[in-house]
Interface confidence: low
């Protein structure tokens, strides 16, 4: 399990993003999003934390500058966090880079990744 410190770190990066998970994980049987408010999924929190860190690390987001920052973003913090961070970046670095270069907010990027649990997604 992730440590309380991990969640504290995540919350610190979430002040603007607030409080329930807008992506809501899965679509209902008719294609409508399920509308119950959910706690933020851990993956969603991880995403916001990492994307906001990356934003701070690059002045002007370009493919190269974001890619360079991505190699460093998981180096700080406790080892449990570093593992979580590296696993996330392995899966989603290309989308995160694309979003940052395009000027998307952390919330837009992470919401669009549908990282609440379970991430069923469409075809």
């Amino acid at each position: 399990r992730l440590s309380p410190e991990y969640y504290d770190l995540a919350r610190a990066h979430l002040r603007d993003e607030e409080k329930s998970c807008p992506c809501l994980a899965q679509e209902g049987p008719q294609g409508d999003l399920l509308t119950k408010t959910q706690e933020l999924g851990a993956d969603y929190r991880t995403c916001l934390t990492i994307v906001q860190k990356l934003k701070k690390m690059v002045d002007k987001p370009t493919q190269r500058s974001v890619s360079n920052a991505a190699t460093r973003v998981c180096r700080t913090g406790r080892s449990a966090w570093r593992d979580v961070c590296r696993n996330f970046m392995r899966a989603y670095q290309s989308r995160v880079t694309q979003g940052l270069v395009a000027g998307e907010t952390a919330q837009q990027i992470c919401e669009d990744l549908r990282l609440c649990i379970p991430s069923t997604g469409p075809l």
């Epitope: 008719q30 294609g31 997604g121 075809l123």
Partner: antibody
Framework: QVQLQQSDAELVKPGASVKISCKAS????????IHWVKQKPEQGLEWIGY????????WYNEKFKGKATLTADKSSSTAYMQLNSLTSEDSAVYFC??????????WGAGTTVTVSS | DIVMTQTPLSLPVSLGDQASISCRSS???????????LHWYLQKPGQSPKLLIY???NRFSGVPDRFSGSGSGTDFTLKISRVEAEDLGVYFC?????????FGGGTKLEIK
């Protein structure tokens, strides 16, 4: 990297059942749904349904209810699809796939099922 | 179920030409969340389909910029600005706004 390895081709008799597998590797199996898609020779694609191994949720295309049964074994990171009461209409290639909203799209190589007496 | 109608069924082109494939849905594909879940795939013989474009106009990772998607509501288009040999195969559109998620019948891009 993420891979979905499907079981080998099957030749089965009309009326029989077949169970095909899709073994996932390179990611946490319980984090993402596995979808199944049917493709008849030289034809289009049909979505059969999906299973969420994390919580056991299964959604089916109404057309395949009773025909397909989706299951998953977390211990072996393997999804299964059983097809029942087979007819020649069920002869097709069946693909499993993992999808994560467009940014991560991985398909198995497909399993060919041939129904013939 | 949403019916996805692709035209043409077959599209003969010369290498270097522009190609355009149309996909029309029987109902609007605008989701209640504002997104339009219309995607394009390419399938080569003996292979599984590969995602090219997701949500109307977003190129999937690694897809060359000669591929572009456009459209809204019920009418969508995939354009290839300069066809290369590796682009030949069957193109499918797919919608995931409404369950069951459905595919077009396919358009075969082939050499003239």
């Amino acid at each position: 990297q993420v891979q979905l390895q499907q079981s080998d081709a099957e030749l089965v008799k009309p009326g029989a059942s077949v169970k095909i597998s899709c073994k996932a590797s390179g990611y946490t199996f319980t984090d993402h749904a596995i979808h199944w898609v049917k493709q008849k020779p030289e034809q289009g694609l049909e979505w059969i349904g999906y299973i969420s191994p994390g919580n056991g949720d299964v959604w089916y295309n109404e057309k395949f209810k009773g025909k397909a049964t989706l299951t998953a074994d977390k211990s072996s990171s393997t999804a299964y699809m059983q097809l029942n009461s087979l007819t020649s209409e069920d002869s097709a290639v069946y693909f499993c796939k993992r999808w994560n909203y467009g940014y991560f799209d991985v398909w198995g190589a497909g399993t060919t099922v041939t129904v013939s007496s | 179920d949403i019916v996805m109608t692709q035209t043409p069924l077959s599209l003969p082109v010369s290498l270097g030409d522009q190609a355009s494939i149309s996909c029309r849905s029987s109902q609007s594909l605008v989701h209640s969340n504002g997104n339009t879940y219309l995607h394009w795939y390419l399938q080569k013989p003996g292979q599984s389909p590969k995602l090219l474009i997701y949500k109307v106009s977003n190129r999937f990772s690694g897809v060359p910029d000669r591929f572009s998607g456009s459209g809204s509501g019920t009418d969508f288009t995939l354009k290839i600005s300069r066809v290369e040999a590796e682009d030949l195969g069957v193109y499918f559109c797919s919608q995931s706004t409404h369950v069951p998620w459905t595919f077009g019948g396919g358009t075969k891009l082939e050499i003239k």
